[in-house]
């Protein structure tokens, strides 16, 4: 028996569409082999109508396609504008029509319900708006216009031009009679309900001269779009509900086991706490469409989601909705990375951010999630080097370790830095991830002077004390700029007085600038790393002043001043919203932090060669 499976019988009516889903074992060979949909002829041969290699027969041109979903082991054949000629026996299969793996499908297209001659068919989703057009002759122009609904053998008046409105349609129906010369009136029904489904009759005038027109209104429940996303990844629900509800509150909700719908987020400021830090509702376009992004997907996020519009910001019958069924794939391509990173006040964190390794050239970004209103995520740093000015000297995005991971380092931590941050790129949007930074009790492991004033033309030596637990790590000094942190030569100088309990294992690594130039002014970082994986960092600001006294200057922690006040500059905030979430280059304009001079500080940062310690553990 064939391992390919699908619906054995598909039945529909003329004018409709079908989506035939065929299942196959998702082996690597099957995933990549040709998929086809063919029709069995009298001779027994099966003539291809559409295939995964792009072939579409002339009979199917413009109305059919085949889409393969290799990750799920399925492919779907969509056929629109069905006619009774499409009834017949078909096969969906893999490989070659005559000897591949296949499954037999019978398609039956019937005429559909018998409708009176000249009936106009209106097919509309629940909650949307329909406009029924009713023509009439000149002699009936001054006469009463009406719309009836046929229920069995009777006709029930729905609305007429004498201001009658059936209570079932109250506040959602209107009859429009155009100006002179236009021989057509329209009936507009908003917020369609399933119960509105049925046959309607337009009437103008009365007696034997009256004009009549039949309308068949088909109100459809929105079929959920199947969405498959990876664990730890991101999903975007794009919601387009129509201009009619452009100014009405919007929401996304999740259907629960009681078949009600719990609000996940809405434009009235409500948000489910389970999505704290990992959801954004992006402001709507002029047409009323909006999108909701959820990152850090969990298995428990699976389910049926509905987006909709209603003044209460929650699901109500008869208002437009769109539906999705979200499946979260546990065999995720997105690597595990910590969802919570802890740091101490004054210390630092190094956050690993995954990205699609196939997109190594993509621009990388890091933003701070803000929960106010619908949520927003102003960009703090990007791989091109732009850094929000208030983060100058303490934030850097590094391309290392590469191959699907970049690193963001944030130091000089304060309690204000606690919160949720998003890693993203301008490439694959499904790879957005969320990390929470928590500030905990404790002392920074690396100790550096808080504020250093160097004298032009002289020698400056900056110490960085590190504890014994970092003895096997590589140490480095680098000069921070808004495009990164350029590593400088440094010196491992042996025992440090700063960690008395560590004895000989406590070390200090120092940076020497000789001679000091104007270009040396700026932020310097001392840090530890293992290979391409970064650990803690500490930052020190070096100010350069005119020469006053000759001689070298050595700064010890005892003499160090407090770190300078952070510069907070008024800048336009770049946010993930609207289309910008897809392409961060579309963000609002913003001032860029000026590059702080020659990154390497000339080549005067030197190693003290007289040291008895080997240089092996320090950055070169």
């Amino acid at each position: 028996k064939s391992p390919v499976f699908g619906p054995q019988e598909v039945s529909s009516v003329e004018g409709n569409s079908v989506s035939i889903k065929c299942y196959y074992p998702p082996t690597s060979v099957n995933r990549h082999t040709r998929k086809y949909w063919c029709r069995k002829g009298a001779s027994g041969r099966c003539i291809t109508l559409v295939s995964s290699e792009g072939y579409v027969s002339s009979n199917y041109a413009g109305r059919a396609n085949l889409t393969n979903f290799p990750e799920n082991g399925t492919f779907v054949v969509n056929i629109a504008q069905l006619s009774r000629d499409d009834s017949g026996h078909y096969k969906c299969g893999l490989g070659i029509n005559s000897r591949g793996l296949s499954f037999d499908v019978s398609l039956e297209v019937s005429q559909g319900p018998e409708l009176p001659n000249g009936t106009e068919v209106y097919t509309v989703d629940v909650g949307r708006t329909v406009t029924i057009k009713c023509p009439f002759k000149t002699e009936n122009a001054p006469k009463t216009k009406a719309l009836y609904k046929k229920i069995g053998q009777t006709s029930v008046l729905v609305i007429d031009s004498r201001n009658y409105v059936n209570p079932n349609y109250k506040d959602r129906i209107r009859l429009r009679i155009p100006g002179t010369g236009q021989l057509i009136f329209t009936v507009v029904i908003d917020r369609l309900r399933l119960s509105d489904h049925g046959l309607y009759l337009c009437q103008a005038g009365d007696g034997s001269n009256r004009d009549e027109k039949n309308a068949d209104l088909q109100v459809l429940e929105p079929e959920p779009e199947l969405v498959y996303e990876d664990l730890r990844g991101s999903v975007t629900f794009h919601c387009a509900l129509g201009l009619e509800v452009a100014n009405v509150a919007k929401f996304l909700c999740r259907v629960n086991s009681r078949e009600t719908c719990d609000v996940v987020i809405n434009t009235l400021g409500k948000r489910d706490s389970a999505f704290e830090g990992r959801i954004l509702l992006n402001p709507q376009d002029k047409d009323g469409s909006f999108s909701v992004v959820i990152t850090g997907l969990r298995k428990e996020d699976e389910g049926r989601y509905l987006c909709g519009a209603h003044s209460d910001g929650q699901l109500q019958e008869g208002w437009p909705i769109q539906a999705w069924q979200l499946f979260v794939n546990e065999e995720s391509t997105i690597p595990r990375s910590p969802t919570v990173v802890k740091g101490v006040a004054g210390g630092s964190v190094a956050v690993l951010c995954p990205y699609n390794p196939k997109e190594s050239q993509s621009l990388k970004y890091w933003c701070l999630w803000e929960g106010a209103q619908n949520g927003r995520c102003p960009l703090l740093v990007e791989s091109q080097g732009l850094v929000q000015e208030q983060y100058e000297g303490r934030l850097s995005l590094l391309q290392e370790p590469g191959n699907g991971t970049f690193t963001v380092i944030l130091n000089q931590l304060t309690t204000q830095d606690a919160g949720f941050y998003w890693c993203l790129t301008n490439g694959d949007t499904r790879w957005r991830t969320t990390v929470e930074i928590k500030i905990i009790e404790g002392e920074p492991n690396l100790k550096v002077p808080g504020n250093v004033t160097a004298v032009l033309g002289e020698t400056l030596n900056i110490p960085c004390h590190f504890p014994c637990k970092f003895s096997s790590y590589e140490k480095y000094w680098c000069k921070w700029s808004n495009t990164g942190c350029q590593t400088l030569p440094s010196q491992d100088e042996g025992p440090s007085e700063a960690f008395v309990n560590c004895d000989e294992n406590s070390r200090l690594v120092s940076l020497t600038l000789n001679p000091v130039t104007r270009a040396d002014e700026g932020w310097y970082w001392c840090g530890v790393k293992q290979g391409h994986f970064y650990g803690e960092t500490a930052a020190v600001y070096v100010a350069v002043e005119e020469k006053k006294v000759a001689g070298s200057r050595y700064v010890s922690p005892a003499k160090a001043d407090a770190a300078p006040d952070e510069k907070v500059l008024d800048s336009g905030v770049r946010e993930i919203e609207n289309k910008a979430i897809q392409d961060p280059r579309l963000f609002a304009e913003e001032k860029v932090v000026a590059d702080t001079g020659d990154q390497a500080g000339g080549s005067r940062a030197s190693v003290d060669s007289s040291s008895s310690e080997e240089q092996g553990g320090s950055s070169k």
């Epitope: 598909v10 409709n16 299942y23 088909q218 959920p224 259907v255 009681r258």
Partner: nanobody
Framework: QVQLVESGGGLVQAGDSLRLSCAAS????????MGWFRQAPGKEREFVTT??????????YYADSVKGRFTISRDNAKNTVYLQMNSLKPDDTAVYYC?????????????????WGQGTQVTVSS
């Protein structure tokens, strides 16, 4: 909540026919597919047939073991699904369960279904 109630089970002779019904009640607005599974003593629950729908289009799926003998149908107005079983065999003896789903990735997989009935016994004697 969606409630499913099966009926129509019983004891029949091999070669006879039986018609099972499954009536759905409650908030059925999100239901997208209904089907039948069966479980014989000491065996795992196995897929029999499922019908899914979108508007006036129906898709019917059958297990190989029942193809050509069993037919699934539904009455939209009554929110009821029927299973017509012809040419019954002793191997068809089992408890038959009705199941409903909001969305089906694969209709053959029991875990894809959100709601289940209590089951109705079908016994086919030789």
């Amino acid at each position: 909540q969606v409630q499913l109630v099966e009926s129509g089970g019983g004891l029949v002779q091999a070669g006879d026919s039986l018609r099972l019904s499954c009536a759905a009640s409650g908030r059925t607005f999100t239901t997208y597919g209904m089907g039948w599974f069966r479980q014989a003593p000491g065996k795992e629950r196995e897929f029999v047939t499922t019908i899914t729908w979108s508007g006036s289009t129906n898709y019917k799926y059958y297990a190989d073991s029942v193809k050509g003998r069993f037919t699934i149908s539904r009455d939209n107005a009554k929110n009821t699904v029927y299973l017509q079983m012809n040419s019954l065999k002793p191997d068809d003896t089992a408890v038959y369960y009705c199941a409903a789903s909001t969305v089906l990735r694969d209709p053959r997989v029991p875990t894809e279904y959100d709601y289940w009935g209590q089951g109705t016994q079908v016994t086919v004697s030789s």
